[in-house]
């Protein structure tokens, strides 16, 4: 996702997972200076902010995802022990200091472990 100010790359736009897995929502970005990174979650039930931070500083994690998410300075986040309700769309926005922004999306499908799958 090229831009004059910010570039954003999402290596895997769709992720399939099973419940209780830890999932990495992986991205790479480049820009001038230190950007602000924001992840939001969107589903049929609405949209909510997950986390916002500037790499190198403390992340502001929403109450709904406290102790369930971990941030990385490359913009990626990890979701711990996902459930079916974590299925949905994850939108990352990278905004550089001068205001130039880029966004990208990742689709997460989380399914139950079926008994037949274990045999």
């Amino acid at each position: 996702l090229q831009s004059q100010g910010v570039s954003l790359y999402i290596p895997q736009a769709t992720i399939n997972a099973t419940v209780k897995e830890d999932i990495l929502l992986s991205v790479e970005y480049s820009c001038h200076g230190v950007p602000t990174i924001e992840w939001t979650y969107s589903s049929n039930w609405g949209t909510q902010k997950i986390v916002e931070w500037k790499p190198g500083t403390q992340a502001n994690i929403s109450q709904s995802h406290k102790d369930r998410v971990c941030t990385f300075d490359n913009g990626s986040i990890q979701l711990f022990s996902v459930g079916v309700r974590d299925s949905g769309y994850y939108v990352i926005t990278v905004t550089e200091r001068l205001g130039s922004s880029q966004f990208g999306t990742i689709v997460l499908h989380v399914s139950e472990i079926l008994y037949e799958d274990l045999h």
Epitope: T14, T47, V91, T93, Q102, F103, T105, V107
Partner: antibody, heavy 121, light 108 residues
């Protein structure tokens, strides 16, 4: 009834500036992202810029970045596009459109009738 | 950026016939994030389909959208006289937002 009315278009010389406005009514303006999309004569649609409902997040097409600025005044229910360093290739009908929500997803369910910008000497 | 390629450029059909319009994305990741618009001469675009296959408010059920991988399809099952227009696809999976070049559906 949702209504979007663009104004401010006209003839401008290359290198000149222009400010487009889009007056909105019939919905809670601050709750929706807004966009500008342009269409050169006889051509297809080209996205220009989008702004979130609160105005805090903006995105631009590379072709206008650094020259155009999108903004909004939620107290006046009005969207703006400040255009500078205009070029002949900016000649188009400029549409404003309402987003589905305050931010992503960025698709657009209501459109104005457009205002024509002509850049020529 | 994601490039959307629409085909054919022009579709010549008669009222009552079925129209199949294609929109191909240059990369995966568009998945469910595609909209279709209709535009008639001298008018603004009108949203038909969002999220690949959901009809917008007031859109008749002869319009439907589907996808397979990076290929997206708008189908009009029985063309009505008012359906002859230009159709554009648009992706909102990533910035910059992009539109396809359009398909003109004209009367044969």
């Amino acid at each position: 009834e949702v209504q979007l009315v663009e104004s401010g278009g006209g003839l401008v010389q290359p290198g000149g500036s222009l400010r487009l406005s889009c007056a909105a009514s019939g919905f809670t303006f601050s709750s929706y992202a807004m966009t500008w999309v342009r269409q050169a004569p006889g051509k297809g649609l080209e996205w220009v810029s989008v702004i979130s409902g609160g105005g805090g997040t903006t995105y631009y097409a590379d072709s206008v970045k650094g020259r155009f600025t999108i903004s909004r005044d939620n107290s006046k229910n009005t969207l703006y596009l400040q255009m500078s360093s205009l070029r002949a290739e900016d000649t188009a009908v400029y549409y404003c459109a309402k987003g589905y929500s305050s931010g992503w997803p960025y698709y657009f369910d209501y459109w104005g009738q457009g205002t024509l910008v002509t850049v020529s000497s | 950026e994601i490039v959307l390629t629409q085909s054919p450029g022009t579709l010549s059909l008669s009222p009552g016939e079925r129209a199949t319009l294609s929109c191909r994305a240059s990369q995966s990741g568009v998945t469910n994030f595609l909209a279709w618009y209709q535009q008639k001469p001298g008018q603004a675009p009108r949203l038909l389909i969002y999220a690949t296959s959901s009809r917008a408010t007031g859109i008749p059920d002869r319009f439907s959208g589907s996808a397979s991988g990076t290929d997206f399809t708008l189908t009009i099952t029985r063309l009505e006289p008012e359906d002859f227009a230009v159709y554009f696809c648009q992706q909102y999976a990533s910035s910059p937002l992009t539109f396809g070049g359009g398909t003109k559906v004209e009367i044969k």
